[in-house]
């Protein structure tokens, strides 16, 4: 008789990540009798689920069960039905609903209901849905990038996991760029975290880390996108707004209510002579960039040195892994190499911005417009936020690693958050353990 | 001090339109939700119309949906309300209410109120 | 719509005496009640948020609790000053308010 395969003793989790312009859906897999092991869980699947962010459904709350329905669905194919009992659900709101909360506590839990009772529906294990801290969303991506580096695992490794993993035990810093927040988190070297709210405390596998991590609610990059366009408008002579974020050619009508539709743009907020106005682009890198610095309050710091708008900044230390829309943007920039100096970045940029935006749409024409009329915009931001707000250098710029996926797992907060959840993560070193009975299978 | 004062109230014959304004001072007027509560002679308190802070929250109760419309000029710190096609029933004193604050986090109830301005829709 | 029903329409009490208000609703609203004092002739006075929260400038005699579909609102000894129609108000759907409680003077 033929030998039958043993049913692969794993374990699954689901994580949706329900940011401020979409919603993704991620499985995670692991072995079930390596729970405590570094780097044993990995991505199985990743479900874009179609249409905005959840906070964009606060007066159709009733089509938010449709919404994630697809999504759903997949999660139940993938998963075996045996497991799907045994399957937590856990679903993270970040700074899109953390802006409609501060609107209004009762939409933001409304919304928060009718997910809930939504993914209820399905017969997974629901752990809740809720709304992240921006330093939970920082820690839980330093977290995952270093979980999947293998950092907190004590044992040496002669070879190297990926390209850019320096063979130390030193952490990575975390870069993580949202439509509607941005996070650095990253152990300082030495240094006291000046400001309480930013340090973080961990002990994982029996050593202990002081981290710094701060989230800039209002600074993703389509919150930083309106508030440019909020900050210009103030100034235009009329109901054209010549943008240099944007390529030449480029036009745009804009409603100003939709301008003044977020808390971001509070502070630039001002009655303006007309209902609406024209973007037309200049695509000029230079003046972009210009215009972002103005975002970005550096002439105020009540610590030894700030990032900006007052923020505690310590100095820089060791390798930084930049994921989410960093790597998308620099991604579709093919500026993502380990080769591409800070200047040469700086450089393509300049050229990327000033081509005609007809050219740039016959270049790219699988692209959507709305995408593809804002990457000089989001790079230029990029450029600007990492050197002036986060200070880095020509010199430690080769220490930005731009990261999409780790072993097959995609860089962002959701592992950590479900690592954390399923207590996954020790605060000591697991004991070496005798051989388990599936390995001898 | 926080101060909501209402105007634009009169008399009115059913069929016929109205704008209510409110004139806010004492409090960063584009950080709150603004609303209309109403209320009939000798009867309770009924919600009408809300705009939270930045405006992504415009409703309106199912008695006044389709004939009101509330908006707000936050450069002139100033809540309205147009009614038109006006009811015997919608005869009532308006407040203008200011949404209140849990924390950091905007609040659906009502922290201040103005005195009203009486509406009479007779012929 | 979430309908609220205070009972009793009509307390009456007699001054340094405690008072009871109740509000039932009729789905559950979380903690999303508040309540307000009206007098004639003025517009209503926010007395508590939240289900339990003192608003600003409110004595500490009145005090409230409950979440789901039960509140209650608590003036622990009245003074003559309280006399007056008490209204809840849920905010977890889009507002509504109860009919009213008059306290007046036993």
């Known amino acids: 008789t033929q030998n039958k395969a043993l049913p692969e003793n794993v374990k699954y989790g689901i994580v949706l990540d329900a940011g401020s312009s979409h919603t993704s859906l991620y499985i995670y897999k692991w072995p079930a009798e390596k729970e405590n092991d570094t780097g044993v869980v990995h991505q199985v699947e990743e479900c874009r689920v179609k249409g905005p962010g959840i906070s964009k459904f606060v007066q159709k709350v009733n089509e938010i069960g449709i919404y994630l329905t697809d999504c759903m669905e997949r999660a139940r194919e993938v998963i075996p039905r045996s497991q799907h009992q045994e399957t937590p659900v856990y679903l993270g709101a970040t700074a899109g609903m953390r802006l409609l909360r501060m609107e209004s506590e009762e939409l933001a839990d409304r919304v928060l209901d009718v997910v809930e009772r939504s993914l209820s529906n399905y017969p997974f294990d629901f752990q809740g849905a809720r709304i992240i801290t921006g330093q939970e969303e920082g820690a839980y991506g330093w977290i995952t990038i270093n979980y999947l580096l293998g950092k907190f695992s004590q044992k040496t490794r002669w070879f190297s996991i990926v390209p850019y993993e320096t063979n130390n035990q030193e952490t990575f810093g975390a870069l993580d760029l949202g439509g509607a927040s941005t996070q650095v988190t990253f152990v300082p070297q030495n240094q006291t975290i000046e400001s309480p709210d930013n340090a973080l405390q961990f002990r994982l596998y029996g050593k202990d880390y002081n981290v710094y991590t701060h989230s800039f609610l209002c600074y993703g990059k389509d919150q930083a996108l309106w508030q440019k366009l909020a900050k210009d408008i103030q100034v235009a002579s009329n109901e054209i707004l010549r943008d240099p974020c944007f390529h030449p050619g480029y036009k745009k009508v804009v409603n100003v209510s939709d301008l003044y539709k977020t808390p971001c743009t509070k502070r630039f907020e001002m009655t303006l002579p007309f209902q609406q106005f024209e973007i037309q682009g200049i695509g000029n890198y230079q003046q972009c960039h210009q215009s972002i610095l103005e975002l970005f309050n550096t002439s105020y710091c009540p610590y030894s040195q700030c990032a900006f708008n007052g923020i505690f900044l310590p100095p820089l230390q060791g390798d930084f892994g930049a994921f989410s829309a960093f790597y998308f943007v620099m991604k579709f920039l093919n500026l993502t190499s380990e080769k591409v100096s800070q200047e040469k970045v700086t450089e393509m940029m300049k050229k990327f911005c000033a081509q005609p935006w007809e050219e740039i749409k016959t270049s790219y024409a699988g692209v959507k417009e709305k995408y593809l009329s804002e990457y000089c915009f989001s790079g230029t931001y990029i450029l600007s936020l990492l050197l002036q707000g986060y200070h880095f250098t020509a010199d430690s710029w080769e220490h930005i690693h731009f990261i999409g996926k780790i072993q097959g797992s995609d860089a962002g907060w959701t592992l950590g958050y479900m690592l954390n959840l399923t207590n996954m993560i020790p605060a000591e070193q697991p004991l070496s353990t005798p051989l388990s009975h599936s390995t001898y299978v | 001090e926080v101060q909501l004062v209402e105007s634009g109230g009169g008399l009115v014959q059913p069929g016929r339109s109205l704008r209510l304004s409110c004139a806010a001072s004492g409090f960063t007027f584009n950080n709150y939700g603004m609303n209309w509560v109403r209320q009939a002679p000798g009867k309770g308190l009924e919600w009408v119309s809300s705009f939270s802070s930045s405006s992504t929250y415009i409703s309106y109760a199912d008695t006044v949906k389709g004939r009101f419309t509330i908006s707000r000029d936050n450069a002139k710190n100033s809540l309205y309300l147009q009614m038109n096609s006006l009811r015997a029933e919608d005869t009532a004193l308006y407040y203008c209410?200011?949404?209140?604050?849990?924390?950091?986090?905007?609040?659906?109830?009502?922290?201040?109120w103005g005195q009203g301005t009486m509406v009479t829709v007779s012929s | 719509e979430t309908v609220m029903t205070q009972s009793p329409a009509t307390l009456s009490v007699s001054p340094g005496e405690r008072a009871t208000l109740s509000c039932r609703a009729s789905?559950?609203?979380?903690?999303?009640m508040h309540w307000y004092q009206q007098k004639p002739g003025q517009a209503p006075r926010l007395l508590i948020y939240?289900?339990?929260n003192l608003a600003s400038g409110i004595p500490a005699r009145f005090s409230g609790s409950g979440s789901g579909t039960e509140f209650t609102l608590t003036i622990s000894s009245l003074q003559s000053e309280d006399f007056a129609v008490y209204y809840c108000q849920q905010s977890w759907n889009d507002p509504t308010f109860g009919q009213g409680t008059k306290l007046e003077l036993k």
């Open positions: 789905e559950g609203v979380k903690s999303y």
């Open positions: 209410a200011r949404h209140g604050r849990y924390g950091g986090y905007g609040g659906f109830y009502f922290d201040y």
């Open positions: 939240k289900a339990s």
